[in-house]
């Protein structure tokens, strides 16, 4: 049925863009012009079966499953959900809705090679010497940095930070063999007569 | 209070040796790395390394290794750099110093001792 | 090797004046594990040995007049001496302890007008 005026407030005269009953030629947020009129866009979710006419209301269906539109719009067909590839390492983090897409990450150790989360590669692990300074997410890879004096990594890790060395004075010993950024300290007895 | 005394200035011939002595008083002697620092004039400051008199544990720059060798003796609390097989090159002020803390977060030298000048010359 | 780099090499000052001097290292010096910055700074005055000034980047040693400042993280440090006194006339150096070999910057010789 027609709708009064003021249930579809886009026959209003002033939607129309003109005075005087003439064509409009800009429309309202959330509406878009076809044949000189205003019609409604569809809400996000659906799509546009048929634009609006002096008699209708523009009429617009909810996208299927695996489909969605996010914005206000008039197109005639949904988007497709992102399909995560597990044989490309991902996989859902989100679920797509009739509004929003599929979000994708990357199975646990790898990392996403860009923005779009397209593919995935393996954490890097971080050298002898080196330690964890951030660990990898799904979306950024390890980030490493060198071991300072005082403190060791034996082990390629994408896990383990930069180890202080033994304090050997607490154990009433002496360092036998100085650390290295790779390897600890080793105690030992003191040697009195040196 | 922590000091650190060096020899005075050495003459010595090329290809020949010298034992430099860092004498430590005010601390104990075998719990604290004694690093060892070159200067020449126009060549700033150069780290040559370190011992832990305790044990006798070195570190060494890898520029200079089998140039100089570190040694300590903790009944006089003495630590010695000997210098080997001198050439001109090896003319400079050597001091040693003294970290502030023991052994395990990096070295900075809070103590020096007044340096011994080495000069090889023919 | 991490190669400290210190700029100027020398500048000339008149006493009361405000001094900064720059250090800079090839790579990071600051330590995630400890949020520290392994650099000290030292003054050699004429004809004696270093002396400390600042450790962990920005820590006065004791002793040292409050009008010499440690700044600065990562690759990027400044020494400044906020009003110059005649005695200040020495070479200051910067150290990384962050690595070994540790390494000094060339120095900045600052001199008195």
């Known amino acids: 049925d027609y709708k009064d005026d003021d249930d579809k407030d886009y026959k209003d005269d002033d939607d129309k863009g003109g005075s005087g009953g003439e064509p409009p030629t800009a429309c309202r947020e959330k509406q878009y012009l076809i044949n000189s009129q205003c019609c409604s866009l569809c809400q996000p979710g659906q799509k546009l079966v048929s634009d609006c006419t002096e008699f209708t209301e523009t009429e617009c269906l909810p996208c299927g499953e695996s489909e969605f539109l996010d914005t206000w719009n008039r197109e005639t067909h949904c988007h497709q959900h992102k399909y995560c590839d597990p044989n490309l390492g991902l996989r859902v983090q989100q679920k797509g809705t009739s509004e929003t897409d599929t979000i994708c990450t990357c199975e646990e150790g790898w990392h996403c090679t860009s923005e779009a989360c397209e593919s995935c590669v393996l954490h890097r692990s971080c050298s002898p010497g080196f330690g964890v300074k951030q660990i990898a997410t799904g979306v950024s890879d390890t980030i490493c940095e060198p071991c300072p004096v005082g403190f060791f990594s034996n082990v390629s890790s994408a896990f383990e930070k930069c180890h202080p060395w033994t304090s050997c004075e607490t154990k009433d010993l002496v360092v036998q063999q100085a650390g290295t950024n790779k390897t600890d300290v080793v105690c030992g007895p003191q040697d009195r007569l040196r | 209070q922590v000091q650190l005394q060096q020899s005075g200035a050495e003459l010595m011939k090329p290809g020949a040796s010298v034992k430099i002595p860092c004498k430590a008083t005010g601390y104990t002697f075998s719990s604290y790395w004694i690093e060892w620092v070159k200067q020449r004039p126009g060549h700033g400051l150069e780290w040559i390394g370190e011992?832990?008199?305790?044990?006798?544990?070195?570190n060494y720059n890898e520029k200079f290794k089998g140039k100089a060798t570190f040694t300590a003796d903790t009944s006089s609390n003495t630590a010695y750099m000997q210098l080997s097989s001198l050439t001109s090159e090896d003319s400079a002020v050597y001091y040693c110093?003294?970290?502030?803390?023991?052994?395990?977060?990096?070295?900075?030298?809070?103590?020096w001792g007044q340096g011994t000048l080495v000069t090889v010359s023919a | 090797d991490i190669v400290m780099s210190q700029s100027p090499s020398s500048l000339a000052v008149s006493v009361g004046e405000k001094v900064t001097m720059s250090c800079k290292s090839s790579?990071?010096?600051?330590?995630?594990?400890?949020?520290?910055?392994?650099l000290a700074w030292y003054q050699q005055k004429p004809g004696q040995s270093p002396k400390l000034l600042i450790y962990w980047a920005s820590t006065r040693e004791s002793g040292v007049p409050d009008r010499f400042t440690g700044s600065g993280s990562g690759t990027d440090f400044t020494l400044t001496i906020s009003s110059v006194k005649a005695e200040d006339l020495a070479v200051y150096y910067c150290?990384?302890?962050?690595?070994?070999?540790?390494?000094f910057g060339g120095g900045t010789k600052l001199e008195i007008k």
């Open positions: 110093a003294r970290p502030y803390y023991r052994y395990d977060v990096g070295a900075w030298f809070a103590y």
């Open positions: 150290q990384q302890y962050y690595s070994y070999p540790y390494t």
């Open positions: 790579q990071s010096l600051l330590y995630s594990g400890n949020q520290k910055n392994y």
């Open positions: 011992v832990l008199p305790g044990s006798g544990s070195t």
